[in-house]
């Protein structure tokens, strides 16, 4: 006999990363006819919904509305079937952005390489962290960490065309609190010298929508939300 | 088009420092790395080091650890590479020079550095 | 650090001759190596980046060649104003290395 119903799916819209003050939902799916959704942040109860009608609806939104350092942090849910209670979620980890300062990127041997040179990026921040975070944009989330006491080295050795695309860097205060983003540094990587038509990248945005990408599992974009890949969140923890 | 302006010449007094200047323009100044090389007569080029404006950055041939010190000036697109302690050693055409694309493609005209009593 | 070996100091060669530079690295460099020209009163000029690809605006007469330690630059159909001096350079890793450079004369 079953004991527990199979665990929800939790994640962040737009982004798990919010710039401070802005607003973020974050969404709970579970089964429809589940008659109560909890939101649990960092091992306690933070909400409670209770979807009307639950047959009708399969998933809930906790919306925060001003997002800043107190709220960032590790955030699952579960949910309830009659008297059934579900497998927590995956953990969420939900990254307040824009605190204090901005790093600067910069890429090395320069931001035009051939395949199979070795790329360094440099994040540097002069105040007081001693973590860094490098993201590429696009569809596959590639999160690298870095630690130094100004700046962090970031090798990616030597580089493919599957390296190609916009990075920028973080400073990190802890987990949950990061700096502004760096600039974007795009990285082309060529591989054919003679013929530099390449292999599409993963989809790049615009500065000002850089809050709205997502960064999705294995799986790929799901219809109407998208999971965070595992491996990314686990290295935030 | 690409640009790096170098001074002709200094002449210099041993035990003294010079600081050398590269004003660069028609490219992004702060997204390529400044190298500057020394180029003796008869002795070829020596790499000296490299400086990325944008953060200031900067890897060091270990020889030139203690001689050089590379700095940028990011409003006035300009780097500077400061020599301590002249010797006769350092009298020299000192080049720099950037890598836009795969290697060192673009060059300013050089300093000729003599260092004399 | 590496060193690159040029050991010819001085090659001499008529117009329309072809002539082969050659650089020997001390230690494997991969493909990273590049080839420059500084003709007398002027700046160096990138010929050849990794190994074998050629500048923009650089002639098809001037090829790179080679790998692991073992490098030539071949000029074909040599014309008056290929007379400058050669070098080689090594970028595979720090510090950044230069042959001693070889001064091509036209007889």
């Known amino acids: 006999q079953q004991q527990t119903l199979p665990k929800p799916f939790i994640w962040a819209e737009p982004h798990f990363m919010v710039p401070k003050e802005k607003q973020v939902t974050i969404c709970c799916q579970g089964n429809y006819g589940a008659v109560e959704y909890q939101l649990h942040f960092e091992g306690s109860l933070f909400a409670v919904d209770r979807p009307k009608p639950p047959e009708r609806i399969n998933k809930v939104q906790f919306y925060i509305p001003d997002m800043n350092s107190r709220m960032a942090g590790q955030y699952s849910c579960i949910y309830r079937v009659g008297e059934l209670w579900s497998e927590p979620s995956n953990l969420l980890d939900l990254v307040v952005t824009e605190m204090y300062d901005t790093p600067t990127l910069s890429v090395h041997p320069g931001p035009e390489v051939i395949s199979g040179e070795k790329v360094t990026f440099y994040c540097r921040l002069d105040t007081a962290t001693s973590m860094f975070l490098l993201l590429k944009e696009g569809r596959s989330s590639h999160v690298q960490r870095g630690y130094g006491k100004v700046q962090a080295e970031f090798p990616l050795g030597p580089v493919t065309t599957a390296h190609r695309g916009t990075y920028r860097c973080f400073g990190s205060y802890n987990n949950h609190a990061w700096s502004f983003p760096s600039e974007p540094v795009k990285l082309l990587v060529t591989g054919d010298i003679e013929n530099t038509s390449l292999a599409p990248e993963d989809p790049t945005f615009p500065a000002d929508t850089w809050g709205t990408y997502l960064l999705t599992t294995e799986t790929g974009l799901q219809k109407d939300h998208a999971l965070w890949d595992h491996t990314a969140q686990n290295l935030l923890r | 088009q690409v640009q790096l302006q170098q001074p002709g010449a200094e002449l210099v007094k041993p035990g003294a420092s010079v600081k050398l200047s590269c004003k660069a323009s028609?490219?992004?100044?702060?997204s390529y790395w400044m190298h500057w090389v020394k180029l003796r007569p008869g002795q070829g080029f020596e790499w000296?080091?490299?400086?990325?404006?944008?953060?200031?950055?900067?890897n060091y041939n270990e020889k030139f650890k203690r001689k050089a010190t590379l700095t940028v000036d990011k409003s006035s697109s300009t780097a500077y590479m400061q020599l301590s302690s002249l010797t006769s050693e350092d009298s020299a055409v000192y080049y720099c020079?950037?890598?836009?694309?795969?290697?060192?493609?673009?060059w300013g005209q050089g300093t000729s550095v003599t260092v004399s009593a | 650090d590496i060193v690159m070996t040029q050991s010819q100091k001085f090659m001499s060669t008529s117009v329309g001759d072809r002539v082969s530079v050659t650089c020997k690295a001390s230690?494997?460099?991969?493909?990273?190596v590049a080839w420059y020209q500084q003709k007398p009163g002027q700046s160096p000029k990138a010929l050849i980046y990794?190994?074998?690809f050629r500048y923009s605006g650089v002639p098809d007469r001037f090829t790179g060649s080679g790998s692991g330690t073992d490098f030539t630059l071949t000029i074909s159909n040599v014309q008056s104003e290929d007379l400058a001096e050669y070098f080689c350079?090594?970028?595979?890793?720090?510090?950044?290395?230069f042959g001693s450079g070889t001064k091509l004369e036209i007889k």
């Open positions: 020079t950037i890598r836009l694309r795969y290697a060192l493609d673009y």
């Open positions: 028609g490219y992004t100044f702060t």
């Open positions: 000296i080091g490299e400086i990325i404006p944008s953060n200031g950055v900067t």
């Open positions: 230690q494997n460099v991969g493909t990273n």
């Open positions: 990794s190994t074998s």
């Open positions: 350079q090594q970028y595979n890793s720090y510090p950044f290395t």
